[in-house]
């Protein structure tokens, strides 16, 4: 039995539970997913059960193998998986134990603009980067273009202090989980500060 | 790649020995059972028997009992079948095939054939 | 021994056209049976395996379908390489594996 194998898939796409054995016997093969058995496979005897009639079109057996392949990935199929390999030649059964992270392919993702100051000709404001549909474990940078030096931030809210007279400069945030990313559309530091020209001391949202 | 590559062509006299071998590369040869299947001219498949190389344990169909002989070789990765008081009705195409992990009666990677014809 | 009944013998068909081969068990075989597809002057190649379970690289046209002593082979479009002689097989518990006799499919 060795250490809990961390596997990562896409929604829609498929992830295979790598599983090998030496043992000339196996009696049974038995999966289950969160306590709930998934497949029970007799390889002697020829046998693959799969427990719910739905699973049966998303579980194969790449190469004819041990190792579990799951297609059509749902959110919810995220969990702990474990394996038993059962034999007679075994005192006690071969085990593995995986997690499953099931995400989500990013949409483009959105800016909203905090409050905006224009004191002095330099405008300043913090633009937030966030998805719509709060998925998980999204990590969010930050590109400014167009100083000398391409700049890089990390997180979701970037701070912004641009003078008028400088060189435009161009903001896009891009979010990343581990199947995917995704770019915001560019924002233009002149676009954005417009609404506040007029008004050297104003604010607005 | 899997690969099984099977010894050429024999010809033999009634009540002789042939010796057809099975050199198995790229997977681990001593973790899978290794089948010998028989097509005769205008027959059905017959299966004849099995070997675990890493024990040397073998299974044969009934009707082949003292007839075939299987046996293998780790250290060359090579399966042997001898057939014994050959007659002509022992004249056909010998493979030799890997189980699946999976389902250990279905063969998912076969040798080109050996052709065995037993003639006066 | 199990004995496996194919049927038809022969068959004659059009590319495009929709395939079906059966294979009956003289006993309850489960879910272990095996198809493979056989070309003149080669090996046969594994198809399907316990029943269902299509083999690496197999077109999705082939399925297989069945359990217990009656199953059934379905190409669901005939392509041109897939004219060939099919074998269904048991591969169900102790040995002897069996095997039908095969059913060739040939260009009508």
């Known amino acids: 039995s060795g250490p809990v194998k961390e596997l990562v898939g896409s929604v829609g796409g498929a992830v295979t539970f790598p599983l090998k054995s030496k043992v000339k016997q196996v009696d049974s093969i038995v999966w289950t997913f969160n306590t709930t058995p998934l497949v029970t496979i007799q390889p002697e005897g020829g046998t693959i059960i799969v427990t719910q009639n739905r699973n049966r079109e998303r579980v194969d057996f790449p190469d004819g193998g041990y190792s579990l392949k799951l297609s059509k990935l749902k959110k919810n199929d995220s969990g702990i998986y474990y394996v038993g390999i059962y034999s007679s030649s075994l005192q006690q059964p071969s085990t593995q134990e995986y997690v499953l992270h099931v995400y989500e392919h990013l949409s483009k993702p959105k800016v909203t603009m905090g409050l905006q100051s224009n004191k002095n000709g330099t405008c300043v404001t913090n633009l937030t980067c966030c998805m719509e549909h709060g998925e998980e474990d999204v990590i969010y940078t930050w590109k400014a273009l167009g100083q000398a030096a391409n700049e890089s931030h990390n997180g979701s809210i970037l701070p912004i202090s641009w003078r008028w007279g400088e060189s435009d400069m161009t903001f896009i945030c891009v979010a990343r989980n581990p199947v995917s990313r995704n770019f915001s559309s560019p924002i233009l530091a002149r676009k954005l500060c417009e609404g506040a020209a007029d008004d050297p001391d104003s604010s607005m949202v | 790649q899997v690969q099984l590559v099977q010894s050429g062509a024999e010809v033999k006299k009634p009540g002789a020995s042939v010796k057809v071998s099975c050199k198995a590369s790229g997977y681990a040869f001593s973790s899978s059972w290794m089948n010998w299947v028989r097509q005769a001219p205008g027959q059905c498949l017959e299966w004849i028997g099995r070997?675990?190389?890493?024990?040397?344990?073998?299974k044969y169909n009934g009707k082949f009992k003292g007839k075939a002989t299987l046996t293998a070789d780790k250290s060359t990765s090579t399966a042997y079948m001898e057939l014994s008081s050959l007659r002509s009705e022992d004249t056909a195409v010998y493979y030799c095939?890997?189980?699946?992990?999976?389902?250990?009666?279905?063969?998912?990677?076969w040798g080109q054939g050996t052709l065995v014809t037993v003639s006066s | 021994d199990i004995q496996m009944t194919q049927s038809p013998s022969s068959l004659s068909a059009s590319v495009g056209d929709r395939v079906t081969i059966t294979c009956k068990a003289s006993?309850?075989?489960?879910?272990?049976v095996a198809w493979y597809q056989q070309k003149p002057g080669k090996a046969p190649k594994l198809l399907i395996y316990?029943?269902?379970y299509r083999y690496t690289g197999v077109p999705d046209r082939f399925t297989g379908s069945g359990s217990g002593t009656d199953f059934t082979l379905t190409i669901s479009s005939l392509q041109p390489e897939d004219f060939a002689t099919y074998y269904c097989?048991?591969?169900?518990?102790?040995?002897?594996?069996?095997f039908g006799c095969g059913t060739k499919v040939e260009i009508k």
């Open positions: 095939a890997r189980s699946t992990m999976i389902a250990t009666g279905a063969m998912d990677y």
């Open positions: 006993q309850d075989v489960s879910t272990a």
């Open positions: 070997i675990y190389p890493g024990d040397g344990d073998t």
């Open positions: 316990s029943a269902s």
């Open positions: 097989q048991q591969h169900y518990s102790t040995p002897p594996y069996t």
